[in-house]
Amino acid sequence: KSPIFGPEEVNSVEGNSVSITCYYPPTSVNRHTRKYWCRQGARGGCITLISSEGYVSSKYAGRANLTNFPENGTFVVNIAQLSQDDSGRYKCGLGINSRGLSFDVSLEVSQGPGLLNDTKVYTVDLGRTVTINCPFKTENAQKRKSLYKQIGLYPVLVIDSSGYVNPNYTGRIRLDIQGTGQLLFSVVINQLRLSDAGQYLCQAGDDSNSNKKNADLQVLKPEPELVYEDLRGSVTFHCALGPEVANVAKFLCRQSSGENCDVVVNTLGKRAPAFEGRILLNPQDKDGSFSVVITGLRKEDAGRYLCGAHSDGQLQEGSPIQAWQLFVNEESTIPRSPTVVKGVAGGSVAVLCPYNRKESKSIKYWCLWEGAQNGRCPLLVDSEGWVKAQYEGRLSLLEEPGNGTFTVILNQLTSRDAGFYWCLTNGDTLWRTTVEIKIIEGEPNLKVPGNVTAVLGETLKVPCHFPCKFSSYEKYWCKWNNTGCQALPSQDEGPSKAFVNCDENSRLVSLTLNLVTRADEGWYWCGVKQGHFYGETAAVYVAVEERKAAGSRDVSLAKADAAPDEKVLDSGFREIENKAIQDPRLFAEEKAVADTRDQADGSRASVDSGSSEEQGGSSR
């Protein structure tokens, strides 16, 4: 499929001008290659009319130009002094005319309307309101006022001052007679339809002395705005329908076959299943405007979209609308990344998030899509060291591996973590990507004790058992804080006995904390990685208490305090029942979602200093 995109149809009137924008992927080659506009012949072939290399056909001399905008990946063809001879099939394209890097455009130039003298022209958008003003003389002030529409050769009554309304206009038309001082009546037609277009005649009086005024009503179907976005990227439709529909239900729909327009999302709570997890309808302003964000763009998302307002929350005749033609460029600069990541209860996931390399200095975010109402995506973590309180100790955003990708790790998974998450930055909004986390049956691969209590001044050893499947991976322990997880020294204690059917390649790697201090309290993770690519992690909360009896503590899986809702099995391993392993004193639901801040002279969340209090809350 050609990645070139432009308007499928362009309509204009003799004597007018048109401006045609064609989009192309802004690669280095494309930016500098020849751009052209050619007319398709009856026997195939395409005759160049104008190109970016300076050629202008004699047919276009003095009335056309072609301008390339390489930074936007667009070029624009302007054609003036149109005649009906210009109607036809054209191509805008790159390179050689016959090569196929082009887009077909149909140009239709119609004759201007043949209007009677003294005809007032009203040009109004579909779904909007028109007011036709009809002046009259004093002698007709008390006489019948009427509006007719010319249908073929005959005028058909639309409305009159005696109360008649043509059935085609019921509920959307009124006739207003101004105060006695003004010799004027007006007819207001709402929710204009395409079929309302035509010649009207307003009349005051019925005899030969009646006052008449001709009006020509043109109802414009909105020209779709062209939108060119990358596969896997995102698009935002900004819909401004005007304050008169501020309190009417809004919708975005996608045109399917014929005139059908399938609702994608509306303010009445409807959402198409294909857009689950990747759409937001941002609430409307007082002036009735709203926006819809769609992320994780797919090939099949391409097409014509309409936004509108109607009490039913879907397209009806007379809905005011705005239109877009979305083209999804399959030659995407956005790299493929998994759209579904699976994890087990008690286990973890590591999500790779792509971003635009040019924006390495931007703030990175991860948010959880919520489908309630019109969809929203509250942030959970950012690259500046903020983590939402409920996720402390089990969520981290790492700038690694860098160069266009960051990593998000979420552990202590429960069934409540299943859902859609968005990767985004505060830079190029087109690079939002979506990932669905699914919680599947199974056991976590890494085995660690439950919550552990260390004694001030003593030594603590915490084991982590790695199955043989991770034999080629780097194994690590780290201490979690808001800014990431600071690596700590660990000891390989040889093969682990924690796995059935697992050979000598399984491993027991221990974390040792010597001379435990209050600053050692907190969350510790053990995990695996390959270079800068992170795999599974497991979390342990280490509490610190006053000395009771001397000696060091060597924590085994069986001896560790079982976290709430856990059973200690005979084998010495924990069975985690869909609950996050948390310090019992810090249940997220009970914890105030504070957003405290480190002081100017302190660090945001230091591994080496600071008390447990400084680690708590939603600190940053």
């Epitope: 937001l280 703030i363 505060n426 302190g602």
Partner: nanobody, 130 residues
């Protein structure tokens, strides 16, 4: 305690210029991105511009692009907003803020709230009128 104090607002004619300042204290200013947000009379909050911690990554709302310039001096713990070619529609109370906590990015038009940022200043009034 985090404190953000804006200054530099005032009355200016269309086409004129103003420079807003925001003095920050109570946190490690040089480590966080900062934001300018405004609220026009009778309207909702509107995000204006963002600068990252190092001052080397900057973005603007379309409505101010090419006219406003955000900058920061980490040695002085101060954020700036240089506003040129001012228009009547720039009339608003301007706030500096830090720690975006809202729903997705950019802050969706018409939905931005004070709660979407960790800390706010008290604001400075900018009036553009002839």
């Amino acid at each position: 305690e985090v404190q953000l104090v804006e200054s530099g607002g005032g009355l200016v004619q269309p086409g004129g210029s103003l420079r807003l300042s925001c003095a920050a204290s109570g946190f490690a200013f040089s480590r966080y991105g900062m934001y300018w947000v405004r609220q026009a009379p009778g309207k909702g909050l509107e995000w204006v511009s963002t600068i990252n911690s190092g001052g080397d990554y900057i973005i603007y709302a379309d409505s101010v692009k090419g006219r406003f310039t955000i900058s920061r001096d980490n040695a002085k713990n101060t954020l700036y907003l240089q506003m040129n070619s001012l228009k009547p529609e720039d009339t608003a109370v301007y706030y500096c803020a830090e720690g975006y906590r809202g729903s997705e990015w950019p802050p969706p038009a018409f939905t931005l709230q004070r709660a979407d940022f960790a800390s706010w200043g008290q604001g400075t009034q900018v009036t553009v009128s002839s």
